[in-house]
Interface confidence: low
């Protein structure tokens, strides 16, 4: 029977800069029941607090609701593991909510095949930002990434959409059923999970153009851009 091993706070994430959750890995239990507590203070302030909510984030977690989340402040936190033989502390973790945002996936992904009379057909995608993100505050610049692949293919084709919430792709395989997903990230932060896949059947008469892909932003009030295959690969994010 020994004191508990050193725990480790391994991840903190916020969906929207208004709340956040941190998770820790327990160390060895020393063969005895072990209690864990997370304590924190805000850098530049002095009073240390205990985790306000050990439940919401699941086992070995601490959730900070709106009332306990301060923007632009660094939180200094550590986990204390205690059993009958003694205690051990994790290393201190410094957390700035601004840099741990991982949004929910974008919503309402709509995918359509457009076949205008005067232009080549294209695949048109549209989506909405996650509901928890208030873009009006100016706190967020959300960037989007789209991926798509034929249903039976192993490899995804990925496109960086910038801040657009619409995207158009010309070069697709006729007659194939495609899966399409979108994800987002704030300018400082983590990519969301991919949205649920949307399926779209590409018609057999879809005209494919290998040399260039036309991405039209006219619906967004922008200009048409002729983007080469090389340029698209430059925007490819892994």
């Amino acid at each position: 029977q020994l004191p508990p091993g050193k725990p480790e706070i391994f991840k903190c994430r916020s969906p929207n800069k208004e709340t956040f959750t941190c998770w820790w890995r327990p160390g060895t239990d020393g063969g005895l029941p072990t209690n864990y507590s997370l304590t924190y203070h805000r850098e530049g302030e002095t009073l240390m607090h205990e985790c306000p909510d050990y439940i919401t984030g699941g086992p070995n977690s601490c959730h900070f609701g709106k009332q306990y989340t301060s923007m632009w402040r660094t939180y200094v936190m550590m986990v204390n593991a205690t059993n009958q033989m003694g205690s051990s502390f994790s290393d201190e973790l410094y957390v700035d909510v601004t840099y741990i945002v991982q949004p929910d996936p974008p919503l309402e992904l709509t995918v359509e095949v457009k076949q205008p009379e005067d232009r080549k057909p294209y695949l048109w995608m549209k989506w909405s930002p996650p509901t928890l993100i208030d873009l009006k505050t100016g706190w967020f610049t959300l960037l989007y990434e789209i991926r798509l692949k034929p249903e039976k293919a192993a490899e995804w084709e990925t496109h960086f959409a910038g801040q657009q919430t619409e995207f158009k792709i010309l070069s697709l395989h006729p007659g194939q059923k495609y899966l399409v997903q979108v994800r987002c990230k704030p300018d400082h932060g983590y990519w969301s999970a991919w949205s649920p896949a949307t399926f779209i059947q590409i018609p057999s008469d879809f005209i494919m153009n290998d040399e260039q892909k036309l991405i039209s932003e006219e619906d967004l009030g922008g200009e048409q851009k002729l983007i080469s295959e090389e340029d698209l690969h430059h925007h490819h994010h892994h």
Partner: antibody, heavy 116, light 107 residues
Framework: EVQLVESGGGLAQPGGSLRLSCVAS????????MSWVRQAPGKGLDWVGN????????NYVDSVRGRFTISRDNAKNSLFLQMNSLRAEDTGVYYC?????????WGQGTLVTVSS | DIQMTQSPSSLSASVGDSVTITCRAS??????LDWFQQKPGKAPKSLIY???ILQGGVPSRFSGSGYGTDFTLTISSLQPEDFATYYC?????????FGPGTKVDIK
């Protein structure tokens, strides 16, 4: 059990000096900020100042800045308040307090009387 | 400095009464507020921190609420041991400042 025991209070002349001590037990002293708070007879509580875990930062209320110095000795679990240029209005009970996770813990206080 | 005011400065109540004490900050302090109880000749005792989190071992009849500048401490059913003076304190910015206190005595 957290315990804080203050000592060093007593009678001092205006302009004189006193050094208060606070010995801590029952928690990891070096992990926490420490504060001094005082209470004039029959009056409310006044925050005097505090000191960071490693002693590298102190903060003071304006009325004592330049006259009082807070220090600590983590090896001895001890907190100190050096009071110079004492004034009548410094009279009161002086408490040391830990700013611990679940709120503050306080000692029982030591009385400082500044009078000629 | 942030000024803290409390009202009322004193109140008389009976055992079983519900009592509410108000604390107001001169500027926004978010939820950086503590409540303390002090009995004559004794050190203050921490009741609530971060405006609404009950200190370990404090009876659930005590509750705190508020955010920004206006805060309340409520004792839902006053017990004989609750007759004391109650202080709020802000720790948003230095210097930390206490309210002047509210004395709760027996009617």
């Amino acid at each position: 059990e957290v315990q804080l025991v203050e000592s060093g209070g007593g009678l001092a002349q205006p302009g004189g000096s006193l050094r208060l001590s606070c010995v801590a037990s029952g928690f990891t002293f070096s992990t926490y900020w420490m504060s001094w708070v005082r209470q004039a007879p029959g009056k409310g509580l006044d925050w005097v100042g505090n000191i960071k875990q490693d002693g590298s930062e102190q903060n003071y209320v304006d009325s004592v800045r330049g006259r009082f110095t807070i220090s600590r000795d983590n090896a001895k679990n001890s907190l100190f308040l050096q009071m110079n240029s004492l004034r009548a209005e410094d009279t009161g009970v002086y408490y040391c307090a830990t700013l611990l996770t679940k709120g503050d813990y306080w000692g029982q206080g030591t009385l400082v009387t500044v009078s000629s | 400095d942030i000024q803290m005011t409390q009202s009322p400065s004193s109140l008389s109540a009976s055992v079983g009464d519900s009592v509410t004490i108000t604390c107001r900050a001169s500027q926004d302090i978010s939820n950086y507020l503590d409540w303390f109880q002090q009995k004559p000749g004794k050190a203050p005792k921490s009741l609530i921190y971060a405006a609404s989190i009950l200190q370990g071992g404090v009876p659930s009849r005590f509750s705190g609420s508020g955010y920004g500048t206006d805060f309340t401490l409520t004792i839902s059913s006053l017990q004989p041991e609750d007759f004391a003076t109650y202080y709020c304190r802000q720790y948003k910015t230095y210097p930390f400042t206490f309210g002047p206190g509210t004395k709760v005595d027996i009617k």
